[in-house]
Amino acid sequence: QAGPLPKPTLWAEPGSVISWGNSVTIWCQGTLEAREYRLDKEESPAPWDRQNPLEPKNKARFSIPSMTEDYAGRYRCYYRSPVGWSQPSDPLELVMTGAYSKPTLSALPSPLVTSGKSVTLLCQSRSPMDTFLLIKERAAHPLLHLRSEHGAQQHQAEFPMSPVTSVHGGTYRCFSSHGFSHYLLSHPSDPLELIVSGSLEDPRPSPTRSVSTAAGPEDQPLMPTGSVPHSGLRRHWE
């Protein structure tokens, strides 16, 4: 039963996006009074795992020696102290890449784009998928989702950028995912370098600008669209 104890902190090392077969360690940090740590995985019998605390008792380690589909998912942890169980931690979403072969990422009309013009990043999969994700390296909001509705799977998703500013320049990759689990992603596409040229350096848009004034990917999500009109792909980001 959840008590007044502060919630623990949950994180993964080296990160929460792990390639198939690689190791990952999940850490749960509570307080020095903790006697036991419990890790729960959504849609799995609870507890998923229990661990005794490591000295000085304020955290526990949950080891995954080789990442597989079974480990991908949403986790929360708790700790038990003499007065009872803590509140749950904020969730940790452990994502596995390598579940599917890589999609193809291209830029239309070209990866060389003049500031102020438009460009569309196109992520294509040779088999039907229902989620496409566009990731920009070193971006504050790296995950741009395009998810299909009603199970209507697609071979591609378009991520338009207009008008382009210098902030859009950089290295992009995309992933695709199947309806089995949104915690299972494809291998990453080969990287695409988007090069923005222009006689004047565009000022960095402020995070308060609306999407219609073309804030860059570091500031707020792009507005993706389906590969064809009424394609059943739904805009979604996080």
């Epitope: 599917y100 072969s101 193809t104 294509q124 040779r126 088999s127 494809s186 291998h187």
Partner: antibody, heavy 120, light 110 residues
Framework: EVQLVESGGGLVQPGGSLRLSCAAS?????????ISWVRQAPGKGLEWIGS?????????YYATWVKGRFTISRDNSKNTLYLQMNSLRAEDTAVYYC???????????WGQGTLVTVLE | DIQMTQSPSTLSASVGDRVTITCRAS??????LAWYQQKPGKAPKLLIY???TLASGVPSRFSGSGSGTEFTLTISSLQPDDFATYYC????????????FGGGTKVEIK
């Protein structure tokens, strides 16, 4: 050397079963590829049977005409792909190829083929 | 379903001729089209991918064009080694397909 080598073909009676193998060398079947089985009946064109994704989930798709008679699987530890064929018919007589889909979505690597003959 | 229709099914030509083979998809396949050459008793050999890109080691007399639903393979000057059967193939993989290949075009000596 990067190659695919099929084996397991031979003579089989109608209604019988056969398992073909496709051994990959020079690259890993668990890297980011699709692998397809393709067949060619004597004097006929190329016919796609089905494909398996090399990702860890191993999604498979089959041609509509397969109707559950054939199953594609793989063993990553042996770097080998399989085609299990059941309820074989005379019209399944063909050379069976495995082929790799490259980054360009084309079949850039083919095996030499193995002949399956379904004969009374 | 995506149907691939190749024409002609047979083509008689002479050495030095310019030869054109057409492949039509029943719906748009973007540029995901490949062309293969096959000789009797041999596995197919990739000639062109992504509609117009020449595969490694393929002579420059071969060229491909088209996008969407209409595609063409051209041999600018037919050589003795080019008498073979040619197939087109789309790059999509899914469960509603009868085949990913066209029916083939046999290029024979006139």
């Amino acid at each position: 050397e990067v190659q695919l080598v099929e084996s397991g073909g031979g003579l089989v009676q109608p209604g019988g079963s056969l398992r073909l193998s496709c051994a990959a060398s020079g690259f890993s079947l668990s890297s980011s590829y699709w692998i397809s089985w393709v067949r060619q009946a004597p004097g006929k064109g190329l016919e796609w049977i089905g494909s398996i994704d090399s990702g860890s989930v191993g999604i498979t798709y089959y041609a509509t005409w397969v109707k559950g008679r054939f199953t594609i699987s793989r063993d990553n530890s042996k770097n080998t792909l399989y085609l299990q064929m059941n309820s074989l018919r005379a019209e399944d007589t063909a050379v069976y190829y495995c082929a790799r889909h490259g980054d360009n979505w084309a079949l850039d690597l083919w095996g030499q083929g193995t002949l399956v003959t379904v004969l009374e | 379903d995506i149907q691939m229709t190749q024409s002609p099914s047979t083509l008689s030509a002479s050495v030095g001729d310019r030869v054109t083979i057409t492949c039509r998809a029943s719906q748009s396949i973007s540029s995901w089209l490949a062309w293969y050459q096959q000789k009797p008793g041999k596995a197919p050999k990739l000639l062109i991918y992504k509609a117009s890109t020449l595969a490694s080691g393929v002579p420059s007399r071969f060229s491909g064009s088209g996008s969407g639903t209409e595609f063409t393979l051209t041999i600018s000057s037919l050589q003795p080694d080019d008498f073979a059967t040619y197939y087109c193939q789309h790059g999509y993989i899914r469960g509603d397909l009868d085949n990913v290949f066209g029916g083939g075009t046999k290029v024979e000596i006139k």
